[in-house]
């Protein structure tokens, strides 16, 4: 069985301020079980943008219905983009662990650039 890979097909995305950014991510397998999370930045200081398991992320919606048992599309939309949202976004697959889930595979990242609104 092929090991799961996390695919972020877009190296970069350019979005106008005030618009919605779509960040694409797919997994190549349903196994191992575990949640997907999105982060801005890498390393210890990275910012959690979306967690499939829990939390309230009012600006974020998923492109697909993640409650489908065969879902492998973890793309997200982030609304009302501002220049402060610029950065590199990573789609990260975790595998279940006890007591905490363990990072398993990360996508290569998508750089979000924000074009200022014309004045």
């Amino acid at each position: 069985e092929e090991e799961l890979q996390v695919i972020q097909p877009d190296k970069s995305v350019l979005v106008a301020a005030g618009e919605t950014a779509t960040l694409r991510c797919t997994a190549t397998s349903l196994i191992p079980v575990g949640p997907i999370q999105w982060f801005r930045g890498a390393g210890p200081g990275r910012e959690l943008i979306y967690n499939q398991k829990e939390g309230h992320f009012p600006r974020v919606t998923t492109v697909s219905d993640l409650t489908k048992r065969n879902n492998m599309d973890f793309s997200i939309r982030i609304g009302n983009i501002t220049p402060a949202d610029a950065g590199t976004y990573y789609c990260v697959k975790f595998r279940k662990g006890s007591p905490d889930d363990v990072e398993f595979k990360s996508g290569a990242g998508t750089e979000l650039s924000v074009r200022a609104k014309p004045s």
Epitope: P32, T67, R69
Partner: antibody
């Protein structure tokens, strides 16, 4: 407070049909996958159907596939189970259950009894 | 027949620790939960995602996993804990929700 209230149970003859309903409240129904789980008298729990939040994808074990149909109306916050070609072995209490993000169950209704008997 | 295997019965004295095991699922494709059911009542979720406890469940109930076996531990068992306990799972490889046959917990005395 999450509430799930089943209805529609009763006595039906073998080969007959019945539709169960589950009225949901206290949470955003359209955001959660849902399932039906049954329990025959004196027996254990058996999952019989699941449905995605949007309602487009449904799942069944072999024991009921082709006879039972799960559906939902998100505008009415209601889950359904259409049961056809009923058999004596379908006699059970039927519970609706809310699914967690990973398809386990966190909240259960009180159940409705279905008796298949001639 | 049940896909998940758990003992039919466990007996324990009040104040002691009860452990109920469940096995049968592949670690990489399974999530487990534990459900408590008292006579004439609906099941109540005690543990989900192998070891996570809902906020309304007493701390004496805990879940753990080791390989393909999960364990429900009830510390300081009380008379009110006498009930049937079901192990349930989600199998990502088949999109199904198997259950164990249930374990009757008897609190002695």
């Amino acid at each position: 407070e999450v509430q799930l209230v089943e209805s529609g149970g009763g006595v039906v003859q073998p080969g007959g049909s019945l539709r169960l309903s589950c009225a949901a409240s206290g949470f955003t129904f359209s955001s959660n996958a849902m399932s039906w789980v049954r329990q025959a008298p004196g027996k254990g729990l058996e999952w019989v159907a699941g449905i995605s939040a949007g309602g487009s994808d449904t799942y069944y074990p072999a024991s009921v596939k082709g006879r039972f149909t799960i559906s939902r109306d998100n505008s009415k916050n209601t889950l359904y189970l259409q049961m056809n070609s009923l058999r004596a072995e379908d006699t059970a209490v039927y519970y609706c259950a809310r699914e967690t993000w990973n398809h386990l169950f966190d909240y259960w209704g009180q159940g409705t009894l279905v008796t298949v008997s001639s | 027949s049940y896909e998940l295997t758990q003992p039919p019965s466990v007996s324990v004295s009040p104040g002691q620790t009860a452990r109920i095991t469940c096995s049968g699922g592949s670690y990489s494709s399974y999530y487990y939960a534990w459900y408590q059911q008292k006579p004439g009542q609906a099941p109540v979720t005690l543990i989900y995602s192998d070891d996570k406890r809902p906020s309304n469940i007493p701390e004496r109930f805990s879940g753990s996993s080791s390989g393909t076996t999960v364990t429900l531990t009830i510390s300081g068992v009380q008379a009110e804990d006498e009930a049937d306990y079901y192990c349930g799972g989600y199998d990502q490889s088949s999109y199904t929700n198997p259950f164990g046959g249930g374990t009757k917990l008897t609190v002695l005395g």
